[in-house]
Interface confidence: low
């Protein structure tokens, strides 16, 4: 691929590219892409591989340029890079490109999988780990158990999965999980299929998600006491302001991280 001539990295090191409020947002959110150069620059360019490019220019005599994407649509998602240049570099000469920033604009995140490690059948006295695996890193994961209104556990994970440990004696039951962006504006995933954990000798069974009537879906945070959590089968009701789950009354048998947990 032919690109504008790029000098050695030591001459014009790459800038940093970040997104506010987040790199994963719902459609309609205003997103600001910030390109920060390690030295004052004259022109910044925002690039999207293969697009009619540069996508946007900013002429600013400073280290920072902001590119405003108003009321983003899914089509504006994708990979972005930025470069900077100075007038004394000569025509067509740009800095090294920034690392890739991937902007995801979506109503909901892909459904995670929920699996038991080492398996869904628990022996006497053995603990079991449930792994909720999505596709994105740096997400907050939430585990539910059928018949328990409040979420059982929260985990913030740098990996695209989180492991939840269940004590063997209390492990059997029906579970589901989901994940969401760790900060506002929150984007929630679809919830996983349910997973049945059973005692040795009983045999596990898989059930479609809609047949878990006792489980509760993510509801509004405690700051909205008048609102009711929707049922699990209507996981993403239209019109509800989507918020991630915040710790509420915890089930006594399997405590969740306290509210100070950074993943909450």
């Amino acid at each position: 691929d032919i690109t504008p001539s790029v000098p050695p990295a030591s001459y014009h090191p790459k800038p940093w590219l970040g997104a506010q409020p987040a790199t994963v947002v719902t459609p309609g959110v205003n997103v600001t892409l910030r390109c920060r150069a390690p030295q004052p620059a004259w022109r910044f360019g925002l690039f999207k591989p293969g697009e009619i490019a540069p996508l946007l220019f900013r002429d600013v005599s400073s280290e920072l340029a902001e590119f405003f994407l108003e009321e983003v649509t899914p089509a504006q998602g994708g990979i972005y890079r930025c470069c900077y240049r100075r007038p004394d570099w000569g025509p067509g000469v740009w800095s090294q490109p920034s690392d890739v920033l991937e902007l995801l604009v979506t109503e909901e995140l892909p459904r995670p999988s929920l699996v038991a490690l080492p398996g869904p059948v628990v022996g006497p006295g053995a603990n079991v780990s449930l792994r909720c695996a999505g596709r994105l890193r740096n997400m907050s994961f939430v585990l539910y158990r059928e018949g328990v209104a409040a979420p059982l556990q929260y985990r913030h994970s740098a990996q695209p999965w989180a492991d939840f440990t269940l004590l063997g004696a209390r492990a059997p039951g029906t579970y589901s999980c989901y994940y969401h962006t760790p900060s506002a504006p929150y984007v929630l995933s679809q919830r996983s299929e349910v997973l049945v954990i059973s005692w040795e000798g009983e045999g596990p069974e898989a059930r479609p998600a809609s047949s878990a009537p006792g489980m509760q879906a993510p509801g509004p945070p405690p700051s909205d006491p008048g609102a009711q959590a929707p049922s699990l089968s209507s996981f993403r009701p239209r019109g509800l302001v989507l918020q991630p789950l915040l710790p509420q009354t915890q089930d006594s048998w399997d405590p969740a991280p306290p509210p100070s947990d950074p993943g909450v």
Partner: antibody
């Protein structure tokens, strides 16, 4: 080696349809903006349509509604579906790949001739 | 009628310097890159200049591009017989790619 190979051209009657293909090899097809450019006999280059990596395809005004560009990243292939063809659509049709940051077409196919005549 | 305007023809003798102009507006050339293509008879266009003044590898430094305001130009120095071809400028606006009408260069 980087290569683009167009096919699907030929003789078609006015009002007819034709589908052109452009098979790419030698680089990651899905990473780039792809485009069709045409050249009528003895005339200059005319941009027809483009297929971005993300988002909706774009078209020159003359072709909106009659022509449809599409891509199959799994097959490394770009397509141009041409409907309601007219005599003035007679041209060599080239597919081309856009460069990363320069707003230019760095790789071109050899072209395929479309003749619209009764 | 092309949005980018080029002279239909240009000529020069071997060794001479020839310049081809391309005129546009603030919505295309004024705010965006200009590229130049060479099309030899019976062949596909070939990228000659991109980003106003950059040469792809393999293009001789006899070819140079420049841009000023809403106009651009392609200069060919040390003209050779193999430079006889059609030359097209190209830029873009917010939604389309634009080509000049082309300039037929004759080496006398």
């Amino acid at each position: 080696e980087v290569q683009l190979l167009e096919s699907g051209g030929g003789l078609v009657q006015p009002g007819g349809s034709l589908r052109l293909s452009c098979a790419a090899s030698g680089f990651t097809f899905s990473d780039y903006y792809w485009t069709w450019v045409r050249q009528a006999p003895g005339k200059g280059l005319e941009w027809v349509s483009g297929s971005p990596v993300f988002g909706a395809a774009n078209y020159a005004q003359n072709f909106q509604g009659r022509f449809t560009i599409s891509r199959d990243n799994s097959k490394n292939t770009l397509y141009l579906q041409m409907n309601s063809l007219r005599a003035e659509d007679t041209a060599v049709y080239y597919c081309a790949k856009a460069g990363f940051t320069g707003g230019h077409f760095d790789i071109w196919g050899q072209g395929t001739l479309v003749t619209v005549s009764s | 009628q092309s949005v980018l305007t080029q002279p239909p023809s240009a000529s020069g003798t071997p060794g001479q310097r020839v310049t081809i102009s391309c005129s546009g507006s603030s919505s295309n050339i004024g705010n965006n890159y200009v590229s130049w293509y060479q099309q030899l008879p019976g062949t596909a266009p070939k990228l000659l200049i991109y980003g106003n003044s950059n040469r792809p590898s393999g293009v001789p430094n006899r070819f140079s591009g420049s841009k000023s305001g809403t106009s651009a130009s392609l200069a060919i120095s040390g003209l050779r017989s193999e430079d006889e071809a059609d030359y097209y400028c190209q830029s873009y606006d917010s939604s389309s790619w634009l080509f000049g009408g082309g300039t037929k260069l004759t080496v006398l």
